[in-house]
């Protein structure tokens, strides 16, 4: 049994880091493998992650972490029974993938304005709370070419757009994702999408 693709990990910079790797053949990850991880720090204890299958030869493990900060560095040991298959390290702050925003809502009751709001996925005491920026994707269910991205570079988790910038009388969907420049993160996953019917009064023409 050998590791074909070494584990690569990303952290949500809050409580979970996800590591993925591939073995050289079909593997029952949860019964055959264990990923041990330990913070390089005074008094830290070793923890064991039981991986799940991710395709025939792929494995994924969700590492639980408390109080993630930039100084943290973890040692990783991948074991198959008594055999050490791979040894490495992981610094969560250097591989951050933020959590996806939630609770995306479209408010259509403001005259001729669409207000989209969502929730910041981090608590106020997490460093990323005040450092997320967002991308909002809006698309038409009827017209695949009617697809747009709005970059939200301010901190407030909301976006206002004129209803008239979208076509009237058809349904639209929206979703939002986040990233943080300070840690050069990857984009988060998209939030679940939300749907609304866009209707507004055309301005009266003389």
């Amino acid at each position: 049994m050998k590791v074909l693709q070494e584990p690569t990990c990303v952290s949500d910079y809050m409580s979970i880091s996800t590591c993925e790797w591939k073995m050289n053949g079909p593997t029952n990850c949860s019964t055959e493998l264990r990923l041990l991880y330990q913070l390089v720090f005074l008094l830290s204890e070793a923890h064991t992650c039981i991986p799940e299958n991710n395709g025939g030869a792929g494995c994924v493990c969700h590492l639980l972490m408390d109080d993630v900060v930039s100084a943290d560095n973890y040692t990783l040991d991948l074991w198959a029974g008594q055999q050490l298959l791979w040894k490495g390290s992981f610094k969560p702050s250097e591989h951050v993938k933020p959590r996806a925003p939630g609770n995306l809502t479209v408010h259509t009751n403001v005259s001729d304005t669409l207000l989209l709001t969502w929730s910041n996925p981090y608590p106020p005491d997490n460093y990323l709370y005040n450092h997320l920026t967002y991308a909002v994707n809006i698309w038409s269910e009827n017209d695949p070419a009617d697809f747009r991205i709005y970059n939200v570079t301010y901190l407030e988790p909301s976006l206002r757009i004129a209803a008239s910038t979208l076509k009237s009388g058809i349904s639209y969907r929206a979703r939002v994702r986040a990233w943080a420049q300070c840690y050069n993160t990857t984009w988060s996953e998209w939030s679940p999408s939300t749907k609304w019917h866009n209707s507004y009064r055309e301005p009266f023409e003389q």
Partner: antibody
Framework: QVQLVQSGAEVKKPGASVKVSCKAS????????MHWARQAPGQGLEWMGI????????SYAQKFQGRVTMTRDTSTSTVYMELSSLRSEDTAVYYC?????????WGKGTLVTVSS | QSVLTQPPSVSAAPGQKVTISCSGG????????VSWYQQLPGTAPKLLIY???KRPSGIPDRFSGSKSGTSATLAITGLQTGDEADYYC????????????FGTGTKLTVL
């Protein structure tokens, strides 16, 4: 919000022991390390040791090895610091502080006076 | 005796900028992260800066931190009378054993 409430001031004689408590609230007690530091009158801060409330393991500054004991009670979210064989130079304000690589939150401090 | 050296005192007028230095070595500041603490008279220390340059929520952006090599600097702009306090740097010694270190402390006087 996070609160670290320490026990009240103590006056001790040389050779005696003192036990200072620090009750934590407002966060997951076992998810954060707790440090102890002290500050003699008019002096700077001095680190004494650290306890992991999850398992109770400890590490002490070399200067205090053999004289200090840190414990915790997870049922009351309280950590304790006991210093024995007190001498006059142990007169100081003793602080508990939550954190790992740095100290996020501090207790208000407990003044321990050692005097004959 | 701390191995992190700070100036004993600094002073400046309200509205001015002041910097406080913290000098260490390769086994501490040079190989670790720096934090800064403010201790107002008669109170417990309070975290001002961590991770060399990050501010906890609630700390105004008048306070900033930086690190270069084996030394670190705390800068305070737009000085206010309420900033008069003792300031301590902190880091970790990584050799021979891991222990936290505090600087010698600097008394800031707002003239």
């Amino acid at each position: 919000q996070v609160q670290l409430v320490q026990s009240g001031a103590e006056v001790k004689k040389p050779g005696a022991s003192v036990k200072v408590s620090c009750k934590a609230s407002g966060y997951a007690f076992t998810s954060y390390y707790m440090h102890w530091a002290r500050q003699a009158p008019g002096q700077g801060l001095e680190w004494m040791g650290i306890i992991n409330p999850s398992g109770g393991s400890t590490s002490y500054a070399q200067k205090f090895q053999g004289r200090v004991t840190m414990t915790r009670d997870t049922s009351t979210s309280t950590v304790y610091m006991e210093l024995s064989s007190l001498r006059s130079e142990d007169t100081a304000v003793y602080y508990c502080a939550r954190g790992k690589w740095w100290f996020y939150d501090w207790g208000k401090g407990t003044l321990v006076t050692v005097s004959s | 005796q701390s191995v992190l050296t700070q100036p004993p005192s600094v002073s400046a007028a309200p509205g001015q900028k002041v910097t406080i230095s913290c000098s260490g070595g390769s086994s501490n500041i040079g190989n670790s992260y720096v934090s800064w603490y403010q201790q107002l008279p008669g109170t417990a220390p309070k975290l001002l800066i961590y991770d060399n340059n990050k501010r906890p929520s609630g700390i105004p952006d008048r306070f900033s931190g930086s690190k270069s090599g084996t030394s670190a600097t705390l800068a305070i702009t737009g000085l206010q009378t309420g900033d008069e306090a003792d300031y301590y740097c902190g880091t970790w010694d990584t050799s021979p054993s891991m222990i936290p270190l505090f600087g010698t402390g600097t008394k800031l006087t707002v003239l």
